[in-house]
Every structure is written in structure tokens, then in C-alpha cells.
Interface confidence: low
């Protein structure tokens, strides 16, 4: 499977609430001995690999706001630790996963990165990511409402593979 | 603070089994994978498996499958690690080791290890 | 299974040297490998992750690069604390390997 970015870029002004999505593509295996690990991250254009460097979001790491779950299920954060820092991040059945901020400060703007990790027990795991970036705007040029930026078709299998 | 806390050494008889502890605190145990790593006197790291408590299911090293068992209480946040048909080249310091996500395998907290000495 | 060869297996240094040490594994791993640091009758430490990130609260003096089959760690400016003995690890793919560890003394 693939992770595709259905958009590189959100341009959005500060105080507006955001929602970064990513979406498996590609052949998922649904079977019972399958889990999918599924997390977000902020980090930095790395030289070699974009993401390989895990910063927290808003003061929580990727541990913080990971979704576990087998390949029939959908999942949510806890509620209660991410919604005091304004954020959520959800799965759905049809493999889209994001994560929504709320209440958008300057300190917000960076390089954000989903990462899935499917594992398949007594085997090894796949792993895979995709990013994009967020720019939080203030001021007479910032857009009244989130603006977002298709990735390219290159950039929408944003993919490396473990 | 995540903390992993090991039971105490052990001396065990060639062909018997023994099985080590790690207490986990100060964090979330369920969704991090706990490993499982051997250090012979004077020797490298090597990897013998690791469990994700809330999944279950163990992942072993080829080299002990059959020989070692790795399981999890989440009650008692408290992985284990039990092997069996002991030898002496089993002797060396066990150490339980969390990973920093899921079913990966760096390695952030590590318990201070259990000395197993296998003689008769 | 993945092998992991480290170079050299003991160096000696003295304070304030750059030391370098390198990795190789028998296969690609792409960028995951892991470098650990180990004092005697101590656990390891994770230094790096993802080949060339540097953990939380690892001093800046440490870092590594690499990717695919070639990897360093460096040491900017040994500090008397960083005697030690360092492993590589691959994360690419069970059973987990470490490379043979390099042990770094005070010439």
C-alpha cells in the first residue's frame, strides 16, 4: 500500500481551525492477524528523507496521537488529552486519516507528517508516510478561510517504504 | 518519566527454563512494542523478540523460536520473557527495551537488565 | 538475516577529538538504523534514529548520516563521558541486528 497526500500545502489565517489529511491507497489487507498503527508528527526537510525527524504537535509526539486498530475498524485519538491542546486525529473505514487543529497560531506553521505502519504479526511491519505543509497566516494578506493546494501527482504517492 | 523495572538475577541448571520480568511505569504500556535483548559476558546486543501488549502476539528471532516465549499482563504493565531448555551460552544480562512506536524497533527506554547464569 | 559490520571494533582518542565510526549493512535498510552508546554494566542509550536524527536530550556533539548500505556516526569533540562502546542498529527488518560494537578508550 501507498500513502497519498491529497494536498501539499493549507495556507490558512490564524485563529481558523484546519484538518491535514492523508489516505492509504492501494491493496490493504484486511485480515485478522493484520493491525494498522497509524500516527502524526511534525518535522523538518530532511537532506536524505523528508520525515524522518519526529517532533511533537502542540506539545504531544506521535505516541500521544496515534490510532491503533485491526483493517475493519475505525478509530479516534482519546478525546480528552489531544482536544486540551486543540487538536483530534480520526480513521475511517475507506483509509482516510487526519488530524484537525483548532484555534491556528503562527507557531503552528511547519512541515507535518501521517505516518502508517502496518503490522502483521510474527512478521515484520511496512511502514510509510506522507507530508505536507501547513502555513499559518495573519495580517491583511492572510486568506479569510483555509486555502489548500493540490499535491502533484508525483506528490500525492508521497511514499517511503521501511 | 517511563521507567522499566527488571526482576532480580537468576542462577539456573542447564536443560531448566527461566522467566524474567519488566515492570513498566510512567507511561502508556499497551500500544509500545517491548523487546527483548541479550548480552553475553564481553559480547554484542542481540535482538531474541518483542510483543506489542495490546495486539498480543509475539514476534521471535528465528535463532530462538521454539525456546523462548514472550508475553504481556497490560493489568500489571509487566512484559515477560521466559526460556526454556537452558544452556551455557545462554548466560548473559537480559534487557527489556521499549520501542518508541508501535511495531518499531529503535529502542528509546531500556530496563537495567537481569543477569541469567546457567552452570551446573 | 541483515548483517551489520562495524568499523573500527576499538579506537583510542583523547578530549576534544572528532571521532568517527562507521556502519555497513549487508543489505539496503534505507535510512533505518539506530546508534546506541554503552557503559559498562549499564543499558544502552539511544544517541541517533532514522540514521541521522539525534534523540531527545543527546548532546548536539553526536551525529550521524547514511543512508542505504553506509553509515557514520561522529563524535564532534570527545568529552571525557563519551568513553564507551557504541553499537549500530538495523531497523529495517526482523530479526533486529546490531553490528559487533566499537569501543572507544582513552589514548
Known amino acids: 500500500f501507498k500513502v497519498a497526500t491529497p494536498y501539499s500545502l493549507y495556507v490558512c489565517p490564524e485563529g481558523q481551525n484546519v484538518t491535514l489529511t492523508c489516505r492509504l491507497l492501494g491493496p490493504v489487507d484486511k485480515g485478522h492477524d493484520v493491525t494498522f498503527y497509524k500516527t502524526w508528527y511534525r518535522s523538518s526537510r530532511g537532506e536524505v528523507q523528508t520525515c524522518s525527524e519526529r517532533r511533537p504537535i502542540r506539545n504531544l509526539t506521535f505516541q500521544d496521537l496515534h490510532l491503533h486498530h485491526g483493517g475493519h475498524q475505525a478509530a479516534n485519538t482519546s478525546h480528552d488529552l489531544a482536544q486540551r491542546h486543540g487538536l483530534e486525529s480520526a480513521s475511517d473505514h475507506h483509509g482516510n486519516f487526519s488530524i484537525t487543529m483548532r484555534n491556528l497560531t503562527l507557531l503552528d506553521s511547519g512541515l507535518y507528517c501521517c505516518l502508517v505502519v502496518e503490522i502483521r504479526h510474527h512478521h515484520s511491519e511496512h511502514r510509510v508516510h506522507g507530508a505536507m505543509e501547513l502555513q499559518v497566516q495573519t495580517g491583511k494578506d492572510a486568506p479569510s478561510n483555509c486555502v489548500v493546494y493540490p499535491s502533484s501527482s508525483q506528490d500525492s504517492e508521497n511514499i517511503t517504504a521501511a | 518519566q517511563v521507567q522499566l523495572v527488571q526482576s532480580g538475577a537468576e542462577v539456573k541448571k542447564p536443560g531448566s527454563s527461566v522467566k524474567v520480568s519488566c515492570k513498566a511505569s510512567?507511561?502508556?504500556?499497551?500500544?509500545?512494542?517491548i523487546s527483548w535483548v541479550r548480552q553475553a559476558p564481553g559480547q554484542g546486543l542481540e535482538w531474541m523478540g518483542g510483543?506489542?501488549?495490546?495486539?498480543?502476539?509475539?514476534n521471535y528471532a528465528q535463532k530462538f523460536q521454539g525456546r523462548v516465549t514472550i508475553t504481556a499482563d497490560e493489568s500489571t504493565s509487566t512484559a515477560y520473557m521466559e526460556l526454556s531448555s537452558l544452556r551455557s551460552e545462554d548466560t548473559a544480562v537480559y534487557y527489556c527495551?521499549?520501542?518508541?512506536?508501535?511495531?518499531?524497533?529503535?529502542?528509546?527506554?531500556w530496563g537495567q537488565g537481569t543477569l541469567v547464569t546457567v552452570s551446573s | 538475516d541483515i548483517q551489520m559490520t562495524q568499523s573500527p571494533s576499538s579506537l583510542s582518542a583523547s578530549v576534544g577529538d572528532r571521532v568517527t565510526i562507521t556502519c555497513r549493512a549487508s543489505?539496503?535498510?534505507?535510512?533505518?538504523l539506530n546508534w546506541y552508546q554503552q557503559k559498562p554494566g549499564k543499558a544502552p542509550k539511544l544517541l541517533i534514529y532514522?540514521?541521522?536524527s539525534l534523540q531527545s536530550g543527546v548532546p548536539s556533539r553526536f551525529s550521524g548520516s547514511g543512508s542505504g548500505t553506509d553509515f557514520t556516526l561522529t563524535i564532534s569533540s570527545l568529552q571525557p563521558e563519551d568513553f564507551a562502546t557504541y553499537y549500530c542498529?538495523?531497523?529495517?527488518?526482523?530479526?533486529?541486528?546490531f553490528g559487533q560494537g566499537t569501543k572507544v578508550e582513552i589514548k
Open positions: 542498529q538495523q531497523a529495517r527488518d526482523t530479526p533486529i541486528t
Open positions: 532514522a540514521a541521522s
Open positions: 543489505q539496503s535498510i534505507n535510512t533505518n
Open positions: 510512567g507511561g502508556t504500556f499497551s500500544s509500545y512494542a
Open positions: 510483543i506489542i501488549p495490546i495486539f498480543g502476539t509475539a
Open positions: 527495551a521499549r520501542s518508541s512506536y508501535g511495531w518499531s524497533y529503535e529502542f528509546d527506554y
